[in-house]
């Protein structure tokens, strides 16, 4: 899977959208490595 910063940002945006934004406050692109997905 793509693990560039931009891919991580878009994947996280998709995850936030699907979860209705109900995630931890520190669940942001700069804190989340690609392995979190």
């Amino acid at each position: 899977a793509c693990d560039t910063a931009t891919c991580v940002t878009h994947r996280l945006a998709g995850l936030l959208s699907r979860s209705g934004g109900v995630v931890k406050n520190n669940f942001v692109p700069t804190n989340v490595g690609s392995k979190a997905f």
């Epitope: 793509c2 931009t6 700069t30």
Partner: antibody, heavy 119, light 107 residues
Framework: QVQLVQSGAEVVKPGASVKISCKAS????????MNWVKQAPGQGLEWIGD????????HYNQKFKGRATLTVDTSISTAYMELSRLRSDDTAVYYC????????????WGQGTLLTVSS | DIQLTQSPSFLSASVGDRVTITCKAS??????VAWYRQKPGKAPKALIY???YRYSGVPSRFSGSGSGTEFTLTISSLQPEDFATYIC?????????FGQGTKLEIK
């Protein structure tokens, strides 16, 4: 609203260094990566690198590695790109850009900083 | 580095026309392509991410498709503000790379 505001135009001599700033507002600066992009006159876009404001981590385009240095000052929500050993072919507009998710999911770009390298 | 080749480089069209721009990658980049519109003297403006998703506020006349090595941007009905240069970008691999641009001119 989200804004990236860059420092003003620079005219510098070959061999010198320059540091361009990009001040972010309207979002949490440390949450999103900051990219830097070069556009020479009449030319296409060239990615220089990105910086993680949360920890200072960077990725560089090999073409710029060793001459470009990307840093941040989180206390003033500002990213910097320093370019050293300047040459005439560094004359270009330099942009900062960041993809945010909150408050809005968008790819924001600064207005650009024109760097002219001339003796 | 991944090479992105856009075609055509120049395109003449009229208001109301449907136009399609192609971006070909030298290697498989999955769906990880973005499209930008740039007007002279201005910063690029993001239109599409992940090959086919419009950013918020981008008009529905813009659509993207493709995966792997071939991508397209379609403008269904050209508006006066659409005459500009369109640029694709891949972000699947470092360094991110851009296409050379397609200049869309008024016929």
């Amino acid at each position: 609203q989200v804004q990236l505001v860059q420092s003003g135009a620079e005219v510098v001599k070959p061999g010198a260094s320059v540091k361009i700033s990009c001040k972010a507002s309207g979002y949490t600066f440390t949450d999103y990566y900051m990219n830097w992009v070069k556009q020479a006159p009449g030319q296409g876009l060239e990615w220089i690198g990105d910086v993680n404001p949360n920890n200072g981590g960077t990725h560089y385009n090999q073409k710029f590695k060793g001459r470009a240095t990307l840093t941040v000052d989180t206390s003033i929500s500002t990213a910097y790109m320093e370019l050293s050993r300047l040459r005439s072919d560094d004359t270009a507009v330099y942009y900062c850009a960041s993809i945010t998710i909150v408050p809005v999911y968008f790819d924001f770009w600064g207005q650009g900083t024109l760097l002219t390298v001339s003796s | 580095d991944i090479q992105l080749t856009q075609s055509p480089s120049f395109l003449s069209a009229s208001v109301g026309d449907r136009v399609t721009i192609t971006c070909k990658a030298s290697q498989n980049v999955g769906p990880n392509v973005a499209w930008y519109r740039q007007k002279p003297g201005k910063a690029p403006k993001a239109l599409i991410y992940s090959a086919s998703y419009r950013y918020s506020g981008v008009p529905s006349r813009f659509s993207g498709s493709g995966s792997g090595t071939e991508f397209t941007l379609t403008i269904s009905s050209l508006q006066p503000e659409d005459f500009a240069t369109y640029i694709c970008q891949q972000y699947n691999y470092y360094p991110y790379t851009f296409g050379q641009g397609t200049k869309l001119e008024i016929k």
